[in-house]
C-alpha cells in the first residue's frame, strides 16, 4: 500500500508514457490520474515498468472500479491480468472474443492458471454455450481444454463446435467425457462419406456403443490398434471375432501384442477358442470347445 502524498509540482502525468518509469511508487500513486490510466491502458503494455510499479497501477484501477473493470480496460490489461485474483475476475463481464484472446496471449506457454480458468468460465457462462469460435480459440491456446470440462459442462457444447476439435484436444479425455462428446461428433459428421467420416470420428470412438462399432466393421475402415485400445470395454465385448477382424483389417495382427491388456484381454475371454484360432495369431484364453456359454444377464432380463 502506497502512502497518500501530494504530487510534486510539475510531475502530474498528462499522458501514460515512458517517463513514468522514472517515478517512485508514491509518485505514481499521487501523480497518475486513474481515469487517464484507464483510457490509456494500451500504452502501459509498451512501457517496461517494474512489477512493483505495476502493482501501484493495478491499485489505482481497483480504486476507480471497485465493482469490476469495464471491458475497455480488461482488453488492454496485458501482464496486469496475471496480477488479478480469481475474485477480481469474477466481477468482470467479458463478452468479446478479442478480449479473451488478448488475455490468453499474456499467459501463452504457461499452464492454465486459476486466473485463466476463471476468465474462461466467466466468458463461456456469459455466452450461454461453448460455440465454435470460442472452442477454436481455447483449444488453440490449451489443447487439453475440452478434457478439463466435466461431462455436465460438455453437454453444453453444440454439435457444430465439434468441427473445431483436433485429435490432440482429446488426448486426456476420460471415457465419461467421450460418452458425451461422441454422440455430438456423430451428429456433426453424419453427412460425410465412409472414409472421411472415419477420419473425423476416430478420435471420439472412446465413447462409441457396440452397434456403432459393428456398423464400422462393415465399412473397411482399418482401425489402428491405438484407437481400438481406447474403445469402451463394454462396447468391445459383444463384438465377434469376424467383426473385430473386419474392424481392424490389416491391423488385426496387433492384437497379439495387446492380448494381456484391456479391452483385448477381456474380449478374448468372451470368444470361442475355435474362432480365435481362425485369426492365426496364437491368441489364447478363449472359451474351450464344447463349453456352453450362458448369458445370465439375458436370462435375468427375461424372467
Amino acid at each position: 500500500e502506497v502512502e497518500k502524498t501530494a504530487c510534486p509540482s510539475g510531475k502530474k502525468a498528462r499522458e501514460i508514457d515512458e517517463s513514468l518509469i522514472f517515478y517512485k511508487k508514491w509518485e505514481l500513486e499521487a501523480c497518475v490520474d486513474a481515469a487517464l490510466l484507464a483510457t490509456q491502458m494500451d500504452r502501459v503494455n509498451a512501457i517496461p515498468f517494474t512489477y512493483e510499479q505495476l502493482d501501484v497501477l493495478k491499485h489505482k484501477l481497483d480504486e476507480l472500479y471497485p465493482q469490476g473493470y469495464p471491458e475497455s480496460v480488461i482488453q488492454h490489461l496485458g501482464y496486469l491480468f496475471l496480477k488479478m485474483s480469481p475474485e477480481d475476475i469474477r466481477k468482470w463481464n467479458v463478452t468479446s472474443l478479442e478480449t479473451l484472446k488478448a488475455l490468453l496471449e499474456v499467459n501463452k506457454g504457461h499452464e492454465m492458471s486459476p486466473q485463466v480458468a476463471t476468465l474462461i468460465d466467466r466468458f463461456v457462462k456469459g455466452r450461454g454455450q461453448l460455440d465454435k469460435d470460442t472452442l477454436d480459440t481455447l483449444t488453440a491456446f490449451y489443447p487439453g481444454y475440452l478434457c478439463s470440462l466435466s461431462p455436465e459442462e460438455l453437454s453444453s457444447v453444440p454439435p457444430s463446435s465439434i468441427w473445431a476439435v483436433r485429435p490432440q484436444d482429446l488426448d486426456t479425455c476420460d471415457p465419461r467425457q467421450l460418452d458425451v462428446l461422441y454422440p455430438k461428433a456423430r451428429l456433426a459428421f453424419q453427412n460425410m462419406n465412409g472414409s472421411e467420416y472415419f477420419v473425423k470420428i476416430q478420435s471420439f470412438l472412446g465413447g462409441a456403443p457396440t452397434e456403432d462399432l459393428k456398423a464400422l466393421s462393415q465399412q473397411n475402415v482399418s482401425m489402428d490398434l491405438a484407437t481400438f485400445m481406447k474403445l469402451r470395454t463394454d462396447a468391445v465385448l459383444p463384438l465377434t471375432v469376424a467383426e473385430v477382424q473386419k474392424l481392424l483389417g490389416p491391423h488385426v495382427e496387433g492384437l497379439k501384442a495387446e492380448e494381456r491388456h484391456r479391452p483385448v484381454r477381456d474380449w478374448i475371454l468372451r470368444q470361442r477358442q475355435d474362432d480365435l484360432d481362425t485369426l492365426g495369431l496364437g491368441l489364447q484364453g478363449g472359451i474351450p470347445n464344447g463349453y456352453l456359454v450362458l448369458d445370465l444377464s439375458m436370462q435375468e432380463a427375461l424372467s
Epitope: E18, N45, I47, P48, L54, Y79
Partner: nanobody, 115 residues
Framework: LQLVESGGGLVQPGGSLRLSCAAS????????IGWFRQAPGKEREGVSS????????NYADSVKGRFTVSRDNAKHTVYLQMNSLKPEDTAVYYC??????????MGQGTSVTVS
C-alpha cells in the same frame, strides 16, 4: 523466460562500466527494455529505457549525459554504457522488458560498486 544482466563490478569514481541485458529462452528483439537500480535500503528507481526498435530512449535526470542505453538486435542484447560514475551510482542494476500483449520479464540484477 528471463533476462540476464552482466558487466557489473567494482570501479573507481569517474570510471566506466558497460552493463549487458540478454534474454534467456526467447529473443529480446520486440521487447522495450528499461534499466532500473536499487541501492541498499532504498526503493528501486528507473534509470533509462529504450524502445523495441531502439529509436526512442529516455533517461532519469540523475544520469542524463553520463549514461547511454543502446541495443544490438542481431546479438539480442541491450546495453547500458555508464561513464563518469559516482559513488551514488552504487546499486544493483536490473533490466526489465515488455513485449507483445504486455508480456513482462525481469532479471536478477548485477551489482555495481563505485568506490
Amino acid at each position: 523466460l528471463q533476462l540476464v544482466e552482466s558487466g557489473g563490478g567494482l570501479v573507481q569514481p569517474g570510471g566506466s562500466l558497460r552493463l549487458s541485458c540478454a534474454a534467456s529462452g526467447f529473443t529480446l528483439d520486440n521487447y522495450a527494455i528499461g534499466w532500473f537500480r536499487q541501492a541498499p535500503g532504498k526503493e528501486r528507481e528507473g534509470v533509462s529505457s529504450i524502445s523495441s526498435s531502439g529509436g526512442s530512449t529516455n533517461y532519469a535526470d540523475s544520469v542524463k549525459g553520463r549514461f547511454t542505453v543502446s541495443r544490438d538486435n542481431a546479438k539480442h542484447t541491450v546495453y547500458l554504457q555508464m561513464n563518469s560514475l559516482k559513488p551514488e551510482d552504487t546499486a544493483v542494476y536490473y533490466c526489465a522488458g515488455v513485449g507483445d500483449y504486455g508480456r513482462r520479464v525481469m532479471g536478477q540484477g548485477t551489482s555495481v560498486t563505485v568506490s
